[in-house]
């Protein structure tokens, strides 16, 4: 009876997500059969988040809209470990929008989810950011410095990375 009500709850939760994500990949977390964490298929998972590399080329605003339609945001990178995970799935000859922008062109960078911008946990390429006109951030590969961030014009289409919290059922 307990298992039955738990299953019903899970199914109704899954139905919530079905609109955007017809298929979820779930893994059992820990030893407890009741704790499952899921990411939409074919998103990848790292710690408590799911990630999707969008290969469609769009402006920053459209890229963020595209993520939000899927219940996500453009990626907010909080640690070096998280960036190291993300770059495993990126192509070296491409650039990808991050959820980081400077809306007023004042060098006041902000994350889309309002996570405080911490200068000590940023991975800008050397000499970046460097232009008041370039109000959006991308991650790209430079042979001299590997992967890092660069500021660019927000209206120039790029690929992007979406991030959402894992779905717990």
């Amino acid at each position: 009876n307990f298992m039955y009500s738990k299953t019903v709850k899970r199914l109704s939760k899954l139905r919530e997500y079905q609109q955007y994500h017809p298929s979820l990949t779930c893994v059992m977390e820990g030893k407890d059969i009741e704790d499952w964490s899921c990411c939409p298929t074919p998103w990848t998972s790292f710690q408590s988040s799911c990630y999707f590399i969008s290969t469609g080329m769009q402006s920053w605003t459209k890229s963020q809209k595209n993520c939000s339609v899927m219940g996500a945001d453009l990626v907010v990178i909080n640690t070096r470990e998280e960036q190291d995970f993300i770059i495993q799935n990126l192509k070296r000859n491409s650039s990808y929008f991050l959820g980081l922008s400077d809306p007023g062109g004042r060098r006041h960078w902000q994350w889309v989810d309002q996570t405080p911008y911490n200068e000590n946990v940023t991975f800008w390429h050397s000499g970046e950011p460097n232009n008041l006109d370039e109000r959006c951030a991308i991650i790209n590969f430079r042979s001299s410095e590997e992967w890092g961030w660069n500021d660019i014009h927000c209206h120039v289409p790029q690929k992007s990375i979406c991030k959402m919290k894992k779905i717990y059922i």
């Epitope: 062109g105 004042r106 060098r107 460097n130 232009n131 008041l132 006109d133 014009h153």
Partner: antibody
């Protein structure tokens, strides 16, 4: 080649307003913000502010807030700066300058002399 | 606001000399230091940006160096056409600010 052509010298009365222009050519106008810089006679350069030619928003030096209004006309690739409630302290050469990488002003107009005199 | 100080307001040198103009910021400006040349007719040109990078078309006799709060512009082989006033400018923090200028004259 990049060129910034400013409007001609102006003589204006105290309390009046003046609007000077800066027409950009030889590049994509909306890709580069426009800065304005003041130089009073025999004095150093003073940064007034910058306007985004793409978004139309401005960042002003606090010292010039209320004195200066910057605008842009994308269709004619022209930036404007209006100075209001003029006093003798506003007598100066005003330069427009294009925004560049590494927080720099990479190309400058020839300057517009504004003389405030009764 | 960040204060920019050019301690020498005027400098006299001979043609062919090596001339160094200095600029000090009131706080670390992370190499966002630019140098401009203003000719006697009022024309302003960018010479050097980001401490040491030469702007397009600028002769290689101009060079820049420095870090933190202390920066300098060097003209290695002074030419008649270098007679001008030189300004440093920091772009690290808004509002951008300029030094007082150094006027270069020929002996």
């Amino acid at each position: 080649q990049v060129q910034l052509q400013q409007s001609g010298a102006e003589v204006v009365k105290p309390g009046a307003s003046v609007k000077i222009s800066c027409k950009g050519s030889g590049y994509t106008f909306t890709d580069y913000s426009m800065h304005w810089v003041k130089q009073a006679h025999a004095k150093s350069l003073e940064w007034i502010g910058v306007i985004s030619t793409y978004y139309g928003d401005s960042n002003y030096n606090q010292k010039f807030k209320g004195k200066v209004t910057m605008t842009v006309d994308k269709s004619s690739s022209t930036a404007y700066m209006e100075l209001s409630r003029l006093t003798s302290d506003d007598t100066a050469v005003y330069y427009c300058a294009r925004n560049g990488n590494f927080y720099v002003m990479d190309y400058w107009g020839q300057g517009t002399l504004v003389t405030v005199s009764s | 606001d960040i204060q920019m100080t050019q301690s020498t307001s005027s400098l006299s040198a001979s043609l062919g000399d090596r001339v160094t103009i200095t600029c000090q910021a009131s706080q670390d400006i992370s190499n966002y230091l630019n140098w401009y040349q203003q000719k006697p007719d009022g024309t302003v040109k960018l010479l050097i940006y980001y401490t040491s990078r030469l702007h397009t078309g600028v002769p290689s006799r101009f060079s820049g160096s420095g870090s933190g709060t202390d920066y300098s512009l060097t003209i290695s082989n002074l030419d008649q056409e270098d007679i001008a006033t030189y300004y440093c400018q920091q772009g690290n923090t808004l509002p951008w600010t300029f030094g007082g200028g150094t006027k270069l004259e020929i002996k």
